[in-house]
């Protein structure tokens, strides 16, 4: 029998401040760009090395991100959700969505020399 | 992995036209973020062009001279260029980065973009 693929999501609050260069990420999605098919979601595509956002560490490419500043980012034009994070001053908050991808083993299956309890 | 093949580069007169293409693999091309760059013998890469979902930018030289568009059923990206220059002579770069930048004005910089392919070379006589 096939291992079932299953996904962990968990949600964190990242705070982030603007380096020289900027947040240093980059996203998908909005309701005229749906990245991800039946959801117009913002995800993180790109981070880009030694920005603010690889520095701090905890944001990942493939992250949903739910809002800035406290601001929700359901339902926004993709363009729309650029400007929302260019325009989000220097201390931006970002409550993300972390999907992990977690591979379950057979079912009913225990591989010989495992612990039987 | 993202593979671009650029074509329609030649030799031309001073005054002519040429249009680049710039085509990419890949199912979600509407989300790229694009760029043509070139680099003449002897001399740095340097920006030429850049659309993204909803703008376009050119560098001060090509302005008026040049358009940037797209055709995301095709997977393509052209740069038609009329009023050649000599000073136009270079290899013509496309390049690509997946997704937006959510910061201002980065578009210029080659480091921006995660794929490039392999160059088309233009020569103005």
């Known amino acids: 029998m096939n291992g079932r693929v299953d996904y962990l999501v968990t949600e964190e609050e990242i705070n982030l401040t603007r380096g020289p260069s900027g947040l240093g990420f980059n996203i998908v999605g909005g309701t005229d760009q749906q990245y991800v098919s039946n959801d117009s979601g913002i995800y993180v595509s790109r981070i880009k090395e030694n920005g603010a956002a690889a520095l701090d560490g905890r944001l990942q490419e493939g992250d949903k991100i739910l809002s800035v500043n406290g601001q929700d980012l359901k339902n926004l034009l993709h363009q729309d959700a650029v400007d929302l994070f260019r325009n989000a001053g220097y201390a931006v908050s970002l409550r993300v969505q972390h999907r992990l991808q977690v591979q379950n083993g057979p079912i009913g299956h225990r591989g010989e020399g495992d612990p039987s309890g | 992995e993202v593979q671009l093949v650029e074509s329609g580069g030649g030799l031309v007169q001073a005054g002519g036209s040429l249009r680049l293409s710039c085509t990419a693999s890949?199912?979600?091309?509407?989300?790229?973020?694009m760029g043509w760059f070139r680099q003449a013998p002897g001399k740095e890469r340097e920006f030429v062009a850049h659309i993204s979902w909803s703008s376009t930018y050119y560098a001060d030289s090509v302005k008026g001279r040049f358009t940037i568009s797209r055709d995301n059923a095709k997977n393509t990206m052209y740069l038609q260029m009329n009023s050649l220059k000599p000073e136009d002579t270079a290899v013509y770069y496309c390049?690509?980065?997946?997704?937006?930048?959510?910061?201002?004005?980065?578009?210029?910089?080659?480091?921006?973009?995660?794929?490039w392919g392999q160059g088309t070379q233009v020569t103005v006589s």
């Open positions: 890949g199912r979600t091309f509407s989300t790229y973020t």
């Open positions: 390049a690509v980065a997946i997704g937006s930048p959510v910061d201002s004005y980065r578009h210029r910089d080659p480091l921006e973009y995660d794929y």
